[in-house]
Interface confidence: low
């Protein structure tokens, strides 16, 4: 398994609608045709998978229908958007990139983006 550098922003503030976007950029050592991008969340020393997508270079990222993530790719950059975030989802979101095909297999893991989520104040007439 060969290492690959992955860069991502240190801090991102989610919008009032609970949407956070950031760029994950990887230094591709070869001409990969198939790339897998995974977003991991690290909290309290636990790592959990948020979403993942495999894409062919030049094509769009396809996340599962029920995924909270969407994304677009451009060259060695992936623009990731995570939706539906609440204050409790604040944490470190790590971008993991795998160059799946052709061999050799490369794996790169970013240092993480701290996403801060602030729940909007409820409207005065809200029941919640």
């Amino acid at each position: 398994c060969k290492a690959m550098h992955v860069a991502q922003p240190a801090v991102v503030l989610a919008s009032s609608r609970g949407i956070a976007s950031f760029v994950c950029e990887y230094a591709s050592p070869g001409k990969a045709t198939e790339v897998r991008v995974t977003v991991l969340r690290q909290a309290d020393s636990q790592v959990t998978e948020v979403c993942a997508a495999t894409y062919m270079m030049g094509n769009e990222l396809t996340f599962l229908d029920d995924s909270i993530c969407t994304g677009t790719s451009s060259g060695n950059q992936v623009n990731l958007t995570i939706q539906g975030l609440r204050a409790m989802d604040t944490g470190l979101y790590i971008c993991k990139v795998e160059l799946m095909y052709p061999p050799p297999y490369y794996l790169g893991i970013g240092n993480g983006t701290q996403i801060y989520v602030i729940d909007p104040e409820p409207c005065p007439d809200s029941d919640f």
Epitope: C1, T38, L40, Q46, P102, P103, P104, Y105
Partner: antibody
């Protein structure tokens, strides 16, 4: 050091059930799944299914569906595999294995020592 | 299910030999293949994953190649501790399936 330690050998009668345990140590238990693989005497390896230690999701081999249940106890970092309605062709060594993981694919990087289950009348 | 066929089923070789084991999938599995080594009475040990990635701690004399339906495991120079049974495993599609194994014996 990652270790998976399985429970001891079992002898069961046809129709009975067996529950094998697998205690994990040396890594964050909830960051990986536990898969179960069995090997009949002198035969090859057969994947039985896996359980996510994070959320308890399972995926079982279709041929065992309805007879197998996999569970975990995160407080003790232990996985369990129960096989019911045992038949003679269930006689095998049962292995637990680490995987899949969040940072790995559906392959198995650490294995338990194996538990021999003998089904005989 | 995807059927994994290994060849040969058994193989005799000498220390220092170069050995190649083949694994064929009944349908394309991309690079989603792992290789394991198993010694009698012991659990399998992961050697290669993603068709060509060497597992940490595994000697560099082991290498894997292939994609799609045909894969090979090569041991460049056999050592005494390499005599064992080798299995391939696909992790492209449920159910995960293993090859029937290749028993590598001393000539």
């Amino acid at each position: 050091e990652v270790q998976l330690v399985e429970s001891g050998a079992e002898v069961k009668k046809p129709g009975a059930s067996v529950k094998v345990s697998c205690k994990a140590s040396g890594y964050t238990f909830t960051s990986y799944g536990i898969s179960w693989v069995r090997q009949a005497p002198g035969q090859g390896l057969e994947w039985m299914g896996w359980i996510s230690a994070y959320n308890g999701n399972t995926n079982y081999a279709q041929k065992l569906q309805g007879r197998v249940t996999m569970t975990t106890d995160t407080s003790t970092s232990t996985a369990y595999m129960e096989l019911r309605s045992l038949r003679s062709d269930d006689t095998a060594v049962y292995y637990c294995a680490r995987g899949p993981g969040i940072l790995t694919g559906y392959y198995f990087d650490y294995w338990g020592q194996g538990t021999l289950v003998t089904v005989s009348s | 299910e995807i059927v994994m066929t290994q060849s040969p089923s058994s193989l005799s070789a000498s220390v220092g030999d170069r050995v190649t084991i083949t694994c064929r999938a009944s349908q394309g599995i991309n690079y989603h293949l792992a290789w394991y080594q198993q010694k009698p009475g012991k659990a399998p040990k992961l050697l290669i994953y993603a068709a060509s990635a060497l597992q940490s701690g595994v000697p560099s004399r082991f290498s894997g190649t292939g994609s799609g339906t045909e894969f090979t495991l090569t041991i460049s120079s056999l050592q005494p501790e390499d005599f064992a049974t080798y299995y391939c495993q696909q992790f492209n599609t449920y159910p995960l399936t293993f090859g029937g194994g290749t028993k590598l014996e001393i000539k």
